[in-house]
Interface confidence: medium
Amino acid sequence: QSYSISQLDIFSQETPLDMAPASFDDQYAGCLADMTAALPDLNHSEFQANKVYADGWAQANNQWQERRAWGSVWGSLPPSPPGFRDEHGVALLAYTANSPLHKEFNAAVREAGRSRAHYLHHFSFKTLHFLLTEALQLLRSHRSRGCQQVYRGVHGLRFRPAGPGATVRLGGFASASLKNVAAQQFGEDTFFGIWTCLGAPIRGYSFFPEEEEVLIPPFETFQVINTSRPTQGPARIYLRALGKRSTYNCEYIKEKKCRSGPCWLGSS
Protein backbone atom coordinates (compact mmCIF):
# COMPACT_ATOMS: atom_id res chain seq x y z
CA GLN A 1 0.00 0.00 0.00
CA SER A 2 1.27 3.45 -0.88
CA TYR A 3 1.22 6.59 1.21
CA SER A 4 -1.20 9.34 0.38
CA ILE A 5 0.25 12.83 0.05
CA SER A 6 -1.06 13.78 3.50
CA GLN A 7 0.58 10.74 5.03
CA LEU A 8 3.83 11.62 3.32
CA ASP A 9 3.89 14.99 5.05
CA ILE A 10 4.66 13.43 8.41
CA PHE A 11 7.94 12.06 7.12
CA SER A 12 9.47 15.45 7.39
CA GLN A 13 13.05 14.46 6.81
CA GLU A 14 12.97 12.51 3.64
CA THR A 15 16.35 12.62 1.97
CA PRO A 16 16.45 12.62 -1.82
CA LEU A 17 18.14 9.59 -3.31
CA ASP A 18 19.92 11.08 -6.30
CA MET A 19 23.43 11.47 -7.72
CA ALA A 20 24.60 13.07 -4.47
CA PRO A 21 26.23 15.96 -6.33
CA ALA A 22 27.93 17.37 -3.22
CA SER A 23 29.60 14.08 -2.31
CA PHE A 24 33.39 13.91 -2.44
CA ASP A 25 34.03 11.03 -4.82
CA ASP A 26 37.77 10.98 -5.62
CA GLN A 27 39.05 7.61 -6.87
CA TYR A 28 42.74 8.73 -6.77
CA ALA A 29 43.35 7.32 -10.24
CA GLY A 30 47.00 7.78 -11.12
CA CYS A 31 48.11 9.30 -7.81
CA LEU A 32 48.03 6.43 -5.33
CA ALA A 33 51.81 6.58 -4.74
CA ASP A 34 51.79 10.36 -4.34
CA MET A 35 48.91 10.18 -1.87
CA THR A 36 50.61 7.43 0.12
CA ALA A 37 53.76 9.56 0.37
CA ALA A 38 51.71 12.52 1.59
CA LEU A 39 49.89 10.54 4.30
CA PRO A 40 52.19 10.92 7.33
CA ASP A 41 52.12 14.72 7.34
CA LEU A 42 48.47 14.87 6.35
CA ASN A 43 47.40 12.38 9.00
CA HIS A 44 49.25 14.28 11.70
CA SER A 45 47.61 17.58 10.82
CA GLU A 46 44.17 15.95 10.65
CA PHE A 47 44.59 14.39 14.09
CA GLN A 48 45.24 17.86 15.48
CA ALA A 49 42.22 19.32 13.71
CA ASN A 50 39.78 16.52 14.43
CA LYS A 51 39.50 14.90 17.86
CA VAL A 52 36.83 12.40 16.81
CA TYR A 53 39.16 11.17 14.07
CA ALA A 54 42.21 11.06 16.37
CA ASP A 55 40.33 9.13 19.06
CA GLY A 56 38.75 6.74 16.58
CA TRP A 57 42.08 6.07 14.90
CA ALA A 58 43.81 5.41 18.23
CA GLN A 59 41.12 2.93 19.26
CA ALA A 60 41.29 1.17 15.89
CA ASN A 61 45.09 1.09 15.91
CA ASN A 62 45.09 -0.64 19.30
CA GLN A 63 42.60 -3.19 18.01
CA TRP A 64 44.66 -3.77 14.86
CA GLN A 65 47.85 -4.37 16.84
CA GLU A 66 45.96 -6.78 19.10
CA ARG A 67 44.58 -8.67 16.12
CA ARG A 68 47.99 -8.83 14.50
CA ALA A 69 49.54 -10.18 17.68
CA TRP A 70 46.84 -12.78 18.22
CA GLY A 71 45.61 -13.28 14.67
CA SER A 72 47.32 -16.62 14.17
CA VAL A 73 45.72 -17.90 17.38
CA TRP A 74 42.21 -16.53 16.87
CA GLY A 75 42.19 -16.59 13.09
CA SER A 76 40.97 -13.02 13.33
CA LEU A 77 42.99 -11.57 10.46
CA PRO A 78 42.36 -12.77 6.91
CA PRO A 79 45.23 -13.02 4.43
CA SER A 80 45.70 -9.51 3.09
CA PRO A 81 45.80 -8.78 -0.62
CA PRO A 82 49.00 -7.48 -2.22
CA GLY A 83 49.56 -3.82 -1.40
CA PHE A 84 47.35 -3.92 1.69
CA ARG A 85 49.11 -2.10 4.53
CA ASP A 86 48.51 -1.76 8.25
CA GLU A 87 46.93 1.64 7.78
CA HIS A 88 44.28 0.17 5.48
CA GLY A 89 43.31 -2.26 8.23
CA VAL A 90 43.25 0.47 10.84
CA ALA A 91 41.10 2.68 8.59
CA LEU A 92 38.54 -0.09 8.12
CA LEU A 93 38.46 -0.84 11.85
CA ALA A 94 38.07 2.86 12.62
CA TYR A 95 35.19 3.15 10.17
CA THR A 96 33.33 0.11 11.51
CA ALA A 97 33.80 0.84 15.23
CA ASN A 98 30.81 1.72 17.37
CA SER A 99 31.93 5.32 17.71
CA PRO A 100 30.87 8.68 16.26
CA LEU A 101 33.62 8.51 13.64
CA HIS A 102 31.75 6.82 10.79
CA LYS A 103 28.82 9.13 11.33
CA GLU A 104 30.83 12.36 11.27
CA PHE A 105 33.02 11.07 8.46
CA ASN A 106 30.11 10.25 6.17
CA ALA A 107 28.35 13.52 6.94
CA ALA A 108 31.54 15.30 5.89
CA VAL A 109 31.98 13.15 2.75
CA ARG A 110 28.45 14.02 1.64
CA GLU A 111 29.31 17.73 1.77
CA ALA A 112 33.01 17.84 0.89
CA GLY A 113 32.39 17.76 -2.84
CA ARG A 114 30.46 21.02 -2.85
CA SER A 115 33.60 22.56 -4.28
CA ARG A 116 37.29 21.81 -4.62
CA ALA A 117 38.02 24.54 -2.10
CA HIS A 118 35.61 23.01 0.41
CA TYR A 119 37.42 19.68 0.17
CA LEU A 120 40.87 21.23 0.41
CA HIS A 121 40.20 23.59 3.30
CA HIS A 122 37.27 22.19 5.29
CA PHE A 123 37.40 18.40 4.95
CA SER A 124 39.52 16.99 7.76
CA PHE A 125 39.11 13.34 6.78
CA LYS A 126 41.30 13.31 3.66
CA THR A 127 43.49 10.48 4.97
CA LEU A 128 40.58 8.27 5.96
CA HIS A 129 38.80 8.88 2.66
CA PHE A 130 41.92 7.90 0.71
CA LEU A 131 42.69 4.83 2.80
CA LEU A 132 39.14 3.50 2.62
CA THR A 133 38.99 4.09 -1.12
CA GLU A 134 42.30 2.32 -1.72
CA ALA A 135 41.47 -0.49 0.72
CA LEU A 136 38.25 -1.25 -1.14
CA GLN A 137 40.08 -1.28 -4.46
CA LEU A 138 42.66 -3.73 -3.08
CA LEU A 139 40.11 -6.00 -1.45
CA ARG A 140 37.92 -6.01 -4.53
CA SER A 141 40.78 -6.91 -6.87
CA HIS A 142 41.68 -9.76 -4.52
CA ARG A 143 38.16 -11.19 -4.59
CA SER A 144 37.18 -13.88 -7.05
CA ARG A 145 33.52 -12.96 -7.30
CA GLY A 146 32.60 -9.85 -9.25
CA CYS A 147 29.26 -8.42 -8.18
CA GLN A 148 27.16 -9.44 -5.22
CA GLN A 149 23.75 -8.96 -3.66
CA VAL A 150 23.85 -7.05 -0.39
CA TYR A 151 21.34 -5.51 1.97
CA ARG A 152 21.44 -2.16 3.68
CA GLY A 153 19.22 -0.99 6.49
CA VAL A 154 19.02 2.70 7.27
CA HIS A 155 17.89 3.95 10.63
CA GLY A 156 16.24 7.30 11.10
CA LEU A 157 16.10 8.40 7.46
CA ARG A 158 13.57 7.81 4.74
CA PHE A 159 14.80 8.29 1.22
CA ARG A 160 12.77 9.88 -1.50
CA PRO A 161 14.04 8.08 -4.59
CA ALA A 162 13.57 9.06 -8.17
CA GLY A 163 11.39 6.62 -10.08
CA PRO A 164 12.52 3.27 -11.43
CA GLY A 165 15.26 3.69 -14.01
CA ALA A 166 16.85 6.71 -12.34
CA THR A 167 20.61 6.73 -11.80
CA VAL A 168 21.69 7.34 -8.20
CA ARG A 169 24.67 7.19 -5.85
CA LEU A 170 24.62 6.51 -2.13
CA GLY A 171 26.44 9.72 -1.23
CA GLY A 172 29.06 8.39 1.14
CA PHE A 173 30.73 5.12 2.00
CA ALA A 174 27.76 2.83 2.53
CA SER A 175 27.78 -0.16 4.84
CA ALA A 176 25.71 -3.12 3.72
CA SER A 177 25.51 -6.75 4.72
CA LEU A 178 25.58 -10.06 2.91
CA LYS A 179 22.94 -11.13 5.44
CA ASN A 180 19.41 -9.89 4.86
CA VAL A 181 18.47 -10.31 8.52
CA ALA A 182 21.42 -8.25 9.79
CA ALA A 183 20.47 -5.35 7.56
CA GLN A 184 16.81 -5.50 8.53
CA GLN A 185 17.66 -4.82 12.16
CA PHE A 186 19.08 -1.46 11.12
CA GLY A 187 16.48 -0.79 8.46
CA GLU A 188 13.47 0.39 10.38
CA ASP A 189 13.11 3.40 8.13
CA THR A 190 14.60 2.40 4.79
CA PHE A 191 15.72 -1.00 3.56
CA PHE A 192 17.88 -1.37 0.46
CA GLY A 193 18.50 -4.41 -1.66
CA ILE A 194 21.64 -3.63 -3.66
CA TRP A 195 23.47 -5.42 -6.45
CA THR A 196 26.96 -3.92 -6.07
CA CYS A 197 30.03 -4.44 -8.22
CA LEU A 198 32.40 -2.02 -6.48
CA GLY A 199 31.56 -2.88 -2.88
CA ALA A 200 34.10 -5.04 -1.08
CA PRO A 201 33.57 -7.48 1.79
CA ILE A 202 35.36 -6.21 4.88
CA ARG A 203 34.32 -8.89 7.38
CA GLY A 204 37.89 -9.62 8.45
CA TYR A 205 38.62 -5.95 9.06
CA SER A 206 35.45 -5.01 10.91
CA PHE A 207 34.89 -4.49 14.61
CA PHE A 208 31.75 -6.59 14.08
CA PRO A 209 32.62 -9.48 11.74
CA GLU A 210 29.31 -11.23 12.37
CA GLU A 211 27.57 -8.53 10.35
CA GLU A 212 29.25 -9.80 7.15
CA GLU A 213 29.78 -6.21 6.12
CA VAL A 214 30.32 -5.03 2.57
CA LEU A 215 31.48 -1.44 2.09
CA ILE A 216 30.34 0.43 -1.01
CA PRO A 217 32.36 3.45 -2.21
CA PRO A 218 30.68 6.81 -2.86
CA PHE A 219 31.43 6.82 -6.59
CA GLU A 220 29.48 3.66 -7.49
CA THR A 221 26.37 4.42 -9.53
CA PHE A 222 23.15 2.42 -9.44
CA GLN A 223 19.92 2.15 -11.32
CA VAL A 224 16.74 2.21 -9.26
CA ILE A 225 14.96 -1.04 -10.10
CA ASN A 226 11.97 -0.82 -7.80
CA THR A 227 10.68 1.02 -4.74
CA SER A 228 7.83 0.33 -2.36
CA ARG A 229 6.49 2.38 0.52
CA PRO A 230 4.27 0.31 2.79
CA THR A 231 2.28 2.09 5.48
CA GLN A 232 3.90 -0.20 8.05
CA GLY A 233 7.59 -0.94 8.12
CA PRO A 234 10.47 0.46 6.14
CA ALA A 235 10.43 1.92 2.66
CA ARG A 236 12.11 -0.56 0.32
CA ILE A 237 14.47 0.43 -2.47
CA TYR A 238 16.14 -1.97 -4.88
CA LEU A 239 19.26 -0.87 -6.75
CA ARG A 240 21.41 -2.47 -9.46
CA ALA A 241 25.02 -1.49 -10.15
CA LEU A 242 25.58 0.59 -13.26
CA GLY A 243 29.19 1.72 -13.05
CA LYS A 244 31.08 4.56 -11.43
CA ARG A 245 31.17 8.29 -11.68
CA SER A 246 33.50 10.81 -10.07
CA THR A 247 33.62 14.57 -10.29
CA TYR A 248 36.98 14.76 -8.54
CA ASN A 249 40.32 13.04 -9.00
CA CYS A 250 43.62 13.50 -7.13
CA GLU A 251 42.54 16.89 -5.77
CA TYR A 252 44.94 16.91 -2.84
CA ILE A 253 47.94 16.03 -5.01
CA LYS A 254 46.99 18.61 -7.64
CA GLU A 255 46.92 21.25 -4.92
CA LYS A 256 50.28 20.14 -3.53
CA LYS A 257 51.85 20.35 -6.97
CA CYS A 258 50.34 23.78 -7.53
CA ARG A 259 51.98 24.97 -4.33
CA SER A 260 55.39 23.50 -5.08
CA GLY A 261 55.82 24.24 -8.75
CA PRO A 262 54.04 24.77 -12.05
CA CYS A 263 50.33 24.22 -11.52
CA TRP A 264 49.13 20.79 -12.66
CA LEU A 265 45.38 20.66 -13.01
CA GLY A 266 45.03 18.14 -15.78
CA SER A 267 43.40 14.80 -15.17
CA SER A 268 45.62 11.95 -14.08
Epitope: N98, S99, P100, G156, Q185, F186, F208, E210
Partner: antibody, heavy 122, light 106 residues
Protein backbone atom coordinates in the same frame (compact mmCIF):
# COMPACT_ATOMS: atom_id res chain seq x y z
CA UNK B 1 8.33 -3.87 14.72
CA UNK B 2 10.61 -3.15 17.69
CA UNK B 3 8.99 -3.58 21.10
CA UNK B 4 10.28 -3.61 24.66
CA UNK B 5 8.16 -4.69 27.62
CA UNK B 6 9.02 -4.30 31.28
CA UNK B 7 7.79 -6.73 33.91
CA UNK B 8 8.30 -7.05 37.65
CA UNK B 9 6.63 -6.33 40.97
CA UNK B 10 4.51 -3.23 41.34
CA UNK B 11 5.09 -3.04 45.09
CA UNK B 12 8.26 -3.71 47.05
CA UNK B 13 9.09 -3.15 50.70
CA UNK B 14 11.96 -0.97 51.91
CA UNK B 15 15.31 -2.84 52.05
CA UNK B 16 14.07 -5.46 49.58
CA UNK B 17 15.65 -6.16 46.21
CA UNK B 18 13.81 -5.20 43.03
CA UNK B 19 14.18 -7.40 39.95
CA UNK B 20 12.88 -6.05 36.64
CA UNK B 21 12.87 -7.85 33.30
CA UNK B 22 12.80 -6.24 29.87
CA UNK B 23 11.69 -8.56 27.08
CA UNK B 24 12.50 -7.30 23.60
CA UNK B 25 11.30 -8.25 20.16
CA UNK B 26 11.98 -6.99 16.65
CA UNK B 27 15.73 -6.91 17.21
CA UNK B 28 18.38 -9.14 18.70
CA UNK B 29 20.37 -8.49 21.84
CA UNK B 30 23.35 -9.82 19.90
CA UNK B 31 23.13 -6.93 17.42
CA UNK B 32 26.54 -5.33 17.64
CA UNK B 33 25.51 -1.69 17.50
CA UNK B 34 22.55 -1.77 19.82
CA UNK B 35 22.07 -2.07 23.54
CA UNK B 36 19.45 -1.71 26.23
CA UNK B 37 19.26 0.86 29.01
CA UNK B 38 17.15 1.15 32.11
CA UNK B 39 15.84 4.62 32.85
CA UNK B 40 13.51 5.68 35.65
CA UNK B 41 11.17 8.58 36.30
CA UNK B 42 9.83 9.40 39.76
CA UNK B 43 6.24 10.72 39.68
CA UNK B 44 6.18 14.28 38.27
CA UNK B 45 9.96 14.33 37.88
CA UNK B 46 12.61 14.03 35.18
CA UNK B 47 14.16 10.99 33.53
CA UNK B 48 17.20 9.39 35.18
CA UNK B 49 19.49 6.92 33.42
CA UNK B 50 20.36 3.88 35.53
CA UNK B 51 22.39 1.37 33.53
CA UNK B 52 23.05 -0.07 30.08
CA UNK B 53 24.30 -3.27 28.50
CA UNK B 54 25.58 -3.87 24.96
CA UNK B 55 25.83 -7.06 22.88
CA UNK B 56 29.45 -7.62 23.91
CA UNK B 57 28.30 -7.57 27.55
CA UNK B 58 29.82 -4.14 28.10
CA UNK B 59 27.95 -2.63 31.08
CA UNK B 60 27.80 0.76 32.69
CA UNK B 61 26.00 2.06 35.74
CA UNK B 62 24.86 5.36 37.19
CA UNK B 63 27.63 6.54 39.51
CA UNK B 64 25.28 7.37 42.37
CA UNK B 65 23.53 3.98 42.25
CA UNK B 66 26.37 1.73 41.08
CA UNK B 67 26.68 -0.20 44.35
CA UNK B 68 23.00 -1.18 44.22
CA UNK B 69 22.56 -2.07 40.53
CA UNK B 70 23.27 -5.15 38.44
CA UNK B 71 22.35 -5.48 34.77
CA UNK B 72 22.53 -8.69 32.77
CA UNK B 73 21.09 -10.19 29.61
CA UNK B 74 19.93 -13.52 28.30
CA UNK B 75 20.24 -13.26 24.52
CA UNK B 76 18.43 -16.54 23.88
CA UNK B 77 15.38 -15.32 25.81
CA UNK B 78 15.71 -11.75 24.45
CA UNK B 79 15.68 -10.43 28.00
CA UNK B 80 17.60 -7.83 29.95
CA UNK B 81 17.36 -7.98 33.74
CA UNK B 82 18.01 -5.17 36.22
CA UNK B 83 18.31 -5.80 39.94
CA UNK B 84 18.34 -2.98 42.47
CA UNK B 85 19.11 -3.78 46.08
CA UNK B 86 18.10 -2.06 49.31
CA UNK B 87 15.03 -0.33 47.91
CA UNK B 88 13.84 2.87 49.56
CA UNK B 89 10.62 4.91 49.17
CA UNK B 90 12.62 7.50 47.15
CA UNK B 91 13.09 4.77 44.53
CA UNK B 92 9.37 4.87 43.77
CA UNK B 93 9.24 5.57 40.04
CA UNK B 94 8.20 4.35 36.64
CA UNK B 95 11.02 2.16 35.35
CA UNK B 96 11.54 2.07 31.59
CA UNK B 97 13.76 -0.07 29.43
CA UNK B 98 14.84 1.55 26.18
CA UNK B 99 16.82 0.42 23.19
CA UNK B 100 20.08 2.26 22.57
CA UNK B 101 20.92 3.05 19.00
CA UNK B 102 24.64 3.80 18.75
CA UNK B 103 27.08 3.78 21.59
CA UNK B 104 29.05 5.92 23.99
CA UNK B 105 29.41 9.50 22.76
CA UNK B 106 26.62 9.44 20.22
CA UNK B 107 23.89 7.06 21.35
CA UNK B 108 20.24 7.82 21.92
CA UNK B 109 17.18 5.88 23.02
CA UNK B 110 15.10 5.16 19.96
CA UNK B 111 12.47 2.77 21.31
CA UNK B 112 10.99 2.69 24.80
CA UNK B 113 8.91 0.22 26.74
CA UNK B 114 5.61 1.34 28.21
CA UNK B 115 7.17 1.48 31.68
CA UNK B 116 6.29 -0.21 34.94
CA UNK B 117 5.41 1.77 38.05
CA UNK B 118 7.22 0.43 41.11
CA UNK B 119 6.08 1.67 44.50
CA UNK B 120 8.32 1.23 47.53
CA UNK B 121 6.28 1.15 50.70
CA UNK B 122 5.97 -0.88 53.87
CA UNK C 1 28.96 14.21 34.50
CA UNK C 2 27.47 16.69 32.07
CA UNK C 3 24.52 18.61 33.49
CA UNK C 4 21.80 19.71 31.07
CA UNK C 5 19.73 22.75 32.03
CA UNK C 6 16.45 23.26 30.20
CA UNK C 7 14.64 26.53 30.06
CA UNK C 8 12.01 27.53 30.61
CA UNK C 9 10.75 24.83 32.95
CA UNK C 10 7.16 25.56 31.97
CA UNK C 11 5.82 27.57 29.07
CA UNK C 12 2.51 28.12 27.35
CA UNK C 13 1.82 29.00 23.73
CA UNK C 14 -1.21 29.82 21.63
CA UNK C 15 -2.17 27.93 18.51
CA UNK C 16 0.00 29.06 15.60
CA UNK C 17 2.61 30.66 17.85
CA UNK C 18 6.33 29.99 17.37
CA UNK C 19 7.87 28.15 20.31
CA UNK C 20 11.56 27.86 21.24
CA UNK C 21 12.98 26.00 24.21
CA UNK C 22 16.65 25.66 25.07
CA UNK C 23 19.00 23.14 26.58
CA UNK C 24 22.34 24.27 27.98
CA UNK C 25 25.14 21.78 28.69
CA UNK C 26 27.74 22.23 31.44
CA UNK C 27 30.42 21.05 28.97
CA UNK C 28 30.55 20.91 25.20
CA UNK C 29 28.66 18.01 23.62
CA UNK C 30 28.74 16.64 20.07
CA UNK C 31 25.05 15.86 19.66
CA UNK C 32 21.84 16.64 21.48
CA UNK C 33 18.76 14.44 21.35
CA UNK C 34 15.19 15.41 22.30
CA UNK C 35 12.26 13.32 23.53
CA UNK C 36 8.57 14.16 23.76
CA UNK C 37 6.54 12.76 26.62
CA UNK C 38 2.82 13.15 27.12
CA UNK C 39 1.18 12.51 30.48
CA UNK C 40 0.92 8.83 31.33
CA UNK C 41 2.93 7.63 28.35
CA UNK C 42 6.55 6.71 27.75
CA UNK C 43 8.96 9.19 26.11
CA UNK C 44 9.30 9.15 22.34
CA UNK C 45 12.45 9.92 20.39
CA UNK C 46 11.61 13.22 18.75
CA UNK C 47 14.79 14.88 17.46
CA UNK C 48 18.14 13.12 17.34
CA UNK C 49 21.68 14.08 16.35
CA UNK C 50 20.79 17.71 17.14
CA UNK C 51 18.61 18.35 14.10
CA UNK C 52 17.22 15.12 12.59
CA UNK C 53 13.52 14.51 13.07
CA UNK C 54 12.40 11.01 14.02
CA UNK C 55 9.97 9.32 11.65
CA UNK C 56 6.46 10.68 12.10
CA UNK C 57 7.56 13.98 13.61
CA UNK C 58 5.90 16.92 11.84
CA UNK C 59 8.08 19.29 9.83
CA UNK C 60 7.12 22.23 12.06
CA UNK C 61 9.63 20.88 14.59
CA UNK C 62 13.32 21.65 14.23
CA UNK C 63 16.44 21.31 16.32
CA UNK C 64 19.69 23.23 16.24
CA UNK C 65 22.75 24.14 18.25
CA UNK C 66 26.34 23.21 18.95
CA UNK C 67 28.83 23.14 21.78
CA UNK C 68 26.94 23.90 24.97
CA UNK C 69 23.82 25.53 23.55
CA UNK C 70 20.96 23.69 21.84
CA UNK C 71 17.35 24.44 21.06
CA UNK C 72 14.10 22.87 19.91
CA UNK C 73 11.73 25.05 17.90
CA UNK C 74 8.13 24.60 16.80
CA UNK C 75 7.35 26.97 13.95
CA UNK C 76 3.60 26.99 14.58
CA UNK C 77 2.14 25.53 17.78
CA UNK C 78 -0.59 22.92 17.41
CA UNK C 79 -2.72 21.40 20.18
CA UNK C 80 -1.02 18.01 19.84
CA UNK C 81 2.37 19.55 20.62
CA UNK C 82 1.47 20.11 24.29
CA UNK C 83 3.83 17.79 26.17
CA UNK C 84 7.04 17.73 28.16
CA UNK C 85 10.26 17.79 26.11
CA UNK C 86 13.52 16.39 27.47
CA UNK C 87 17.00 16.91 26.04
CA UNK C 88 19.64 14.19 26.37
CA UNK C 89 23.36 13.90 25.68
CA UNK C 90 25.80 11.01 25.52
CA UNK C 91 28.95 12.82 24.52
CA UNK C 92 30.48 11.55 27.70
CA UNK C 93 29.44 8.89 30.16
CA UNK C 94 26.99 8.76 31.77
CA UNK C 95 24.16 9.74 29.43
CA UNK C 96 22.18 12.53 31.07
CA UNK C 97 18.78 14.16 30.62
CA UNK C 98 17.60 17.68 31.23
CA UNK C 99 14.83 18.32 33.75
CA UNK C 100 12.36 18.93 30.93
CA UNK C 101 10.33 21.81 29.52
CA UNK C 102 6.59 21.46 29.95
CA UNK C 103 4.78 23.04 27.01
CA UNK C 104 1.12 23.87 27.57
CA UNK C 105 -1.54 25.18 25.23
CA UNK C 106 -2.60 28.71 26.15
Amino acid sequence: QVTLKESGPVLVKPTETLTLTCTVSGFSLSNARMGVSWIRQPPGKALEWLAHIFSNDEKSYSTSLKSRLTISKDTSKSQVVLTMTNMDPVDTATYYCARIYGGDSWGYFDNWGQGTLVTVSS
Amino acid sequence: QIVLTQSPAIMSASLGEKVTMTCSASSSVSYMHWYQQKSGTSPKRWIYDTSKLASGVPARFSGSGSGTSYSLTISSMEAGDAATYYCQQWSSNPPTFGAGTKLELK
